[in-house]
């Protein structure tokens, strides 16, 4: 799939997206994959990490507007830190204001992504499908 | 966004996707865009054509498995031909068996795509959101 040294002329309005792992979704130079098999949050995180990715991080409603249309519930990389009562991402960054509406359906320290930028709190040990994400440089 | 003549080394497991119109979703070298504004089927078709694309064509559950997760209902390029009673795509090809479950909610000659490969029959003049698709060469 290498594009190097190809003499292909593409319109200026068209562009390549990526690079992404093979058969992942590429959107605005981020890579996403939805995994069907249900795993708990820790296993989901491990699965993403094994693919050089992380669980979904929501950082921009504009750059990630494709997430509006996602059906069902999927683990994302948002975790609750009980000691200070904060929701933060795997990378340690704090959840930015106005990005997600957190809904406490269950008591838990992990969150499921649901359409229209909602986060449902869930027990981290419950199996769910998950979304991995890889940000391109 | 041109990648030509760049000496970038990417893993063999990684690849670029496209080319696609700027800010479209790229998946398995097809380009998709979801449009929020509601239009009737004919206006939706015209909108896609103006962007050198067509309304969504479902041709493979494997290559288009991202469509499983799509929330809501959106115009696709499937139309009913009253003379012979068949459903066919804009390009004239016949709807392959076992690809879509056609559900007759309304009387009509156009179809809305809904998650899990369902097609809902609808009156073509009703406004709905729509999905454009561009197949890369």
């Amino acid at each position: 799939n290498s594009l190097f040294n190809q003499e292909v002329q593409i319109p200026l309005t068209e562009s390549y997206c990526g690079p992404c792992p093979k058969n992942w979704i590429c959107y605005k130079n981020n890579c996403y994959q939805f995994f069907n098999e249900s795993k708990n949050w820790y296993e989901s995180q491990a699965s993403c990490m094994s693919q050089n990715a992380s669980l979904l991080k929501v950082y921009s409603k504009e750059d990630q507007d494709l997430l509006k249309l996602v059906k069902s519930y999927h683990w994302m990389g948002l975790v609750h830190i009980p000691t200070n009562g904060s929701w933060q991402w795997e990378d340690g960054s704090i959840l930015s204001p106005n990005l997600l509406t957190i809904i406490e359906m269950q008591k838990g320290d992990c969150a499921l992504y649901a359409s229209s930028f909602k986060g449902y709190i869930e027990n981290c040990s419950i199996p769910n499908t998950y979304i991995c994400m890889q940000r391109t440089v | 966004n041109s990648l030509f003549n760049q000496e970038v080394q990417i893993p063999l497991t990684e690849s670029y996707c496209g080319p696609c119109p700027k800010n479209w979703i790229c998946y398995k070298n097809n380009c998709y865009q979801f449009f929020n504004e509601s239009k009737n089927w004919y206006e939706s078709q015209a909108s896609c054509m103006s962007q050198n694309a067509s309304l969504l064509k479902v041709y493979s559950k494997e290559d288009q498995d991202l469509l499983k997760l799509v929330k809501s209902y959106h115009w696709m390029g499937l139309v009913h031909i009253p003379t012979n009673g068949s459903w066919q795509w804009e390009d004239g090809s016949i709807l392959s068996p076992n690809l879509l479950t056609i559900i007759e909610m309304q009387k009509g000659d156009c179809a809305l795509y809904a998650s899990s490969f369902k097609g809902y029959i609808e009156n073509c003049s009703i406004p709905n959101t729509y999905i454009c698709m561009q197949r890369t060469v």
Epitope: P82, S86, I94, P97, I102, I103 | -
Partner: antibody
Framework: EVQLLESGGGLVQPGGSLRLSCATS????????MSWVRQAPGKGLEWVSY????????DYADSVKGRFTISRDNSKNTLYLQMNSLRAEDTAVYYC??????????????WGQGTLVTVSS | DIQLTQSPSFLSASVGDRVTITCRAS??????LAWYQQKPGKAPKLLIY???SLESGVPSRFSGSGSGTDFTLTISSLQPEDFATYYC?????????FGQGTRLEIK
């Protein structure tokens, strides 16, 4: 240095309204959950309402639900409490408090000095 | 709603004494418990959070323990400035609730 400064308290008749403000400084206001806590004269502490802009949630004690509204203006780093249909039992010192994180589960890390609301005819 | 019951409600002790205040929750609250000190006419001050974590700047003579439903605040050696009212508070679920308070006075 984190500072919380309440204002807007005073004497009001039963059934009346009052709007409390809490001006803040010394931290990124929009990143933190904020609450109002009150203390009736000679009594203990009672949580009134919570708001998190970051997490997009708001909650109220049953005793004030439907009468009080919490809001914030992130551009002014200010928290508000609109109090309507006031009753004698709402008489208290009202404290503005900052949670340690962006959710109600964090402790009250900092408190203002309080503003006294007296509901009496 | 989760009720918090502090005991004792009133405590008389001397400088240098070791003092323990308990807080019992009506249901399990994991470690979502904080302790506050309040002096007359002043706002409360956070001492302990997450049941046992000492807030920055709080003297080490204060300590907290417990998990689930039973919690304790211990002052290892009372100092004159420690005479105040102490409250426990849970943030496991809303409504956030406080204990009724423990008034610590000089004997």
């Amino acid at each position: 240095e984190v500072q919380l400064l309440e204002s807007g308290g005073g004497l009001v008749q039963p059934g009346g309204s009052l709007r409390l403000s809490c001006a803040t400084s010394g931290f990124t206001f929009s990143d933190y959950a904020m609450s109002w806590v009150r203390q009736a004269p000679g009594k203990g502490l009672e949580w009134v309402s919570y708001n998190s802009f970051s997490v997009g949630s708001t909650d109220y004690a049953d005793s004030v639900k439907g009468r009080f509204t919490i809001s914030r203006d992130n551009s002014k780093n200010t928290l508000y409490l609109q109090m309507n249909s006031l009753r004698a039992e709402d008489t208290a010192v009202y404290y503005c408090s900052k949670h340690s994180g962006n959710y109600y589960t964090g402790p009250f890390h900092y408190w203002g000095q309080g503003t006294l609301v007296t509901v009496s005819s | 709603d989760i009720q918090l019951t502090q005991s004792p409600s009133f405590l008389s002790a001397s400088v240098g004494d070791r003092v323990t205040i308990t807080c019992r929750a009506s249901q399990g609250i994991s470690s979502y418990l904080a302790w506050y000190q309040q002096k007359p006419g002043k706002a409360p001050k956070l001492l302990i959070y997450a049941a046992s974590s000492l807030e920055s700047g709080v003297p080490s003579r204060f300590s907290g323990s417990g998990s689930g439903t039973d919690f304790t605040l211990t002052i290892s050696s009372l100092q004159p400035e420690d005479f105040a009212t102490y409250y426990c508070q849970q943030s496991y679920s809303t409504p956030i609730t406080f204990g009724q308070g423990t008034r610590l006075e000089i004997k």
